[in-house]
């Protein structure tokens, strides 16, 4: 959790002199309560936006927007504290809008935005906007909070961000699996344009339960440059037990940018459907899976209207 260092954030607007300051997340008005305090923010919205750094890297950011209520308490509004809490690590980052002039009612509702909190793929955040000064201990709360779930690297716009590309999001291995004679499974995939080793992991399950009944790992040595984008083949000898037939294959790359922590791709091969009229044949209708670093959901966001991405769980 960090702030974009470029461009410098701005909170001033027509009719308001304002500066953005780093904050300890503990405003002075908590320690020295005031009698008159402003009301809470209205219509807090958080959206996924993207921003370039000076170095040209692209990062996901939380775009925070809120408006003021149309009451007289704006006369006592001295600023706002913006707080982002990363749920899984309890890390918190705050900034403060410090108003250098008094707000006045004007013909349109006051609106504020901030887009400098850099967020991580597949993480959940609690975003809070606190109007300042904060209320006395028993006063009505004058903050608004919302949760914000950042999509994982499967999401179309996220895929091209620097943190996702660093974990191998642009590599599409196009894994294919076919069953051969004599309890064998052949896995093929496309190598990426880096001389890096790969690992292919096979785990087999019975059709009725999700307990593993067989697993094996095969290493693929770093390809030479002329082998980049070529297909690699690995053949596994399967368990002799016919009921150990539901296979989960993962391909794990070890790219230099992510080492042990690169995005994996996977496919599942279901147990064959046995019927009196069909002859067993090679499995072609495997289910492709994308294995991000943790679970994901379906998303829609401002920058990607109308396209949601479905993740097959297993």
């Amino acid at each position: 959790l960090r702030l974009l260092d470029f461009p410098a954030p701005v909170c001033a607007q027509e009719g308001l002199s304002c500066r953005v300051k780093n904050s300890t997340c503990l405003d002075d008005s908590w320690i020295h309560p005031r009698n008159l305090t402003p009301s809470s923010p209205k219509d807090l919205q958080i959206q996924l936006h993207f921003a370039h750094t000076q170095q040209g890297d692209l990062f996901p950011v939380a775009h925070i927007e809120w408006t003021l209520q149309t009451d007289a308490s704006i006369l006592y509004l001295e600023g706002a504290e913006l707080s982002v809490l990363q749920l899984n690590t309890n890390e918190r980052l705050c900034v403060r809008f410090e108003f250098l002039s008094k707000l006045r009612h004007h013909h349109r509702r006051w609106r504020f935005t901030f887009s400098h909190f850099v967020v991580d793929p597949d993480q959940e955040y609690e975003v809070t906007v606190h109007h300042l000064p904060k209320p006395i201990p028993d006063g009505d709360p004058n903050h608004q909070s919302k949760n914000f779930l950042v999509p994982d690297c499967e999401h179309a716009r996220m895929k091209v961000t620097t943190p996702c590309m660093s974990s191998g999001s642009l590599w599409d291995p196009n894994i294919t699996v076919e069953t051969l004679e004599a309890h064998q499974l052949r896995v093929s995939f496309t190598l990426w344009n880096e001389s890096t080793p790969y690992q292919v992991l096979l785990e087999s399950f019975s059709d009725s339960e999700n307990h593993s009944c067989f697993d094996v790992v095969k290493q693929i040595f770093a390809p030479r440059q002329e082998e980049f984008h070529q297909r690699a083949n690995v053949t596994f000898t399967l368990s002799k037990f016919h009921w150990c037939c539901h296979h989960h294959v993962q391909v794990q790359p070890f790219f230099s940018s992510c080492l042990n922590d690169c995005l994996r791709h996977a496919v599942t091969v279901p147990c064959p459907v046995i019927s009196n009229t069909t002859v067993p044949k090679p499995v072609a209708d495997y289910i492709p899976l994308w294995e991000p670093r943790s679970g994901s959901s379906d998303y829609k966001d401002d920058d990607d209207k109308g396209s949601s991405h479905h993740h097959h769980h297993h």
Epitope: L85, L87, N88, Q123, P292, R293, G295
Partner: antibody
Framework: EVQLVESGGGSVQPGGSLRLSCAAS????????MNWVRQAPGKGLEWVSI????????HYADSVKGRFTISRDNAKNSLYLQMNSLRDEDTAVYYC???????????WGQGTTVTVSS | DIQMTQSPSSLSASVGDRVTITCRAS??????LAWYQQKPGKFPELLIY???TLQSGVPSRFSGSGSGTDFTLTISSLQPEDVATYYC?????????FGPGTKVDIK
């Protein structure tokens, strides 16, 4: 001294309800997300639920979803777990735990025992 | 949901031995992994967070390593007071699942 103290445990019949409380002291409670974790007799740890500092994010383990409700009162430095439709398998020691900045849970209560039995 | 497995489920070692416990996630979790020690009748105590960062006050004989799916907790020289059950926990995203635990005792 940073401290968490759970209360509200006891014996209840299957289908019954209990409300657990966790009183926090020695730290700025309103700045932290808070967790409930349980441990059945002779078994391992099971994460139950988390609530963010301002209650805008709440998650539950699948095993308790729809039956348990986590809540907090920052003014009272208190965390709660309302447990309804209790089952035999909910019998456990229930701990409240504070997450460490950076990850993991570094402050735990002593636990309160819940026994569900007919 | 991501499953966590630990091995071995129990072990016996002599005082001074090097002890290694492994934890595996069914999908990559980056370095969002913590290790806990729980002594009989006590609450768990945080040993390691972020896969390899030692919690303050924890003896330096404990160390953690790994990233992605495979993680290790090492006790470089087992002491009598280390008899306990050790749990890993993933915290990349909810649910923040624990591993089943590894019971360590002295031969």
């Amino acid at each position: 001294e940073v401290q968490l103290v759970e209360s509200g445990g006891g014996s209840v019949q299957p289908g019954g309800s209990l409300r657990l409380s966790c009183a926090a002291s020695g730290f700025t409670f309103s700045s932290y997300s808070m967790n409930w974790v349980r441990q059945a007799p002779g078994k391992g740890l099971e994460w139950v639920s988390i609530i963010s500092s301002r209650s805008s994010i709440i998650h539950y383990a699948d095993s308790v979803k729809g039956r348990f409700t986590i809540s907090r009162d920052n003014a009272k430095n208190s965390l709660y777990l309302q447990m309804n439709s209790l089952r035999d398998e909910d019998t456990a020691v229930y701990y409240c735990a504070r997450p460490k900045v950076g990850g993991g849970m570094d402050v735990w209560g002593q636990g309160t025992t819940v026994t569900v039995s007919s | 949901d991501i499953q966590m497995t630990q091995s071995p489920s129990s072990l016996s070692a002599s005082v001074g031995d090097r002890v290694t416990i492994t934890c595996r996630a069914s999908q990559g979790i980056s370095n969002y992994l913590a290790w806990y020690q729980q002594k009989p009748g006590k609450f768990p105590e945080l040993l390691i967070y972020a896969a390899s960062t030692l919690q303050s006050g924890v003896p330096s004989r404990f160390s953690g390593s790994g990233s992605g799916t495979d993680f290790t907790l090492t006790i470089s020289s087992l002491q009598p007071e280390d008899v306990a059950t050790y749990y890993c926990q993933k915290y990349n995203r909810a649910p923040f699942t624990f591993g089943p635990g590894t019971k360590v005792d002295i031969k």
